[in-house]
Interface confidence: low
């Protein structure tokens, strides 16, 4: 497994990570930590593991957290109700 660095699919990353689009270069994907409490997230980034190619630069939230809307277009990993 690729613990850090370039990847194509989640299976190439270590535990607690997913293969997300790089913030800096949209054409590449890098192993990225799963969303922690308070991290920004996208509500549809839920598939873990995901067998295709992710389109967002955020990973799903860690287990026990949910990606919840806090304002019009802002979503954050928060404790599940």
């Amino acid at each position: 497994a690729v613990i850090t660095g370039a990847c194509d699919k989640d299976s190439q990353c270590g535990g607690g990570m997913c293969c997300a689009v790089s913030i800096w270069v949209k054409s590449i994907r890098i192993c990225t930590p799963m969303g922690k409490l308070g991290d920004s997230c996208h509500p549809l980034t839920r598939k873990v593991p995901f067998f295709g190619r992710r389109m967002h630069h955020t990973c799903p939230c860690l287990p026990g957290l949910a990606c919840l809307r806090t304002s019009f277009n802002r979503f954050i990993c928060l404790a599940q109700k």
């Epitope: 509500p43 549809l44 995901f50 067998f51 190619r53 967002h56 277009n73």
Partner: antibody, heavy 121, light 111 residues
Amino acid sequence: EVQLVQSGAEVKKPGASVKVSCKASGYSFTDYDMHWVRQAPGQGLEWIGYISCYNGATTYNQKFKGRVTITVDKSTSTAYLELSSLRSEDTAVYYCARDGNYGEAYAMDYWGQGTLVTVSS
Amino acid sequence: DIVMTQSPDSLAVSLGERATINCKASQSVDYDGDSYMNWYQQKPGQPPKLLIYAASNLESGVPDRFSGSGSGTDFTLTISSLQAEDVAVYYCQQINEDPFTFGQGTKVEIK
């Protein structure tokens, strides 16, 4: 060749439940999510929910919350939709549809042939 | 829920002419530079068929006379040269926020 084969038409009484099956073949079943969509006679499309065929995680349209259950049987590569407390407005063709794995751009690339569920007293 | 409104409800176009279908979302379906909009074609008695995903990506095997464009709340499906086999109902669908919602459909016929 990817195929989704659904169970046959059903006629149910109001208040009853129905369970529709969708047997997948021609691909690795657990690598793709499965959606369910319905279409009332002469009407448009309505998304019901989807399931991860890998871990069974579900997301439902809140409109159906409490009445709908989507499950999978990995051993037979089959997805199921169960809808309870049926009413006349649930009369529709119910489709299963595979998610195409386009990242988070959910898109349904293969569809079952549809199952007509008629709710009538 | 995000409401998708298509226009027109029906459209009659001559063979070989351009057909344009519009879809307006009640709020933006963009995120991080991508537009989360799909287009499907449905012929009578058949299930829908995916044409375009993520606003402008042509599904494999779909003729290149079909194209999708737009961002934010306004999207367009264009058939550059209508063929007889394109007679169908076309649906847009947003997939930016669940529940994933469809437009009411646009029926395309031959003039």
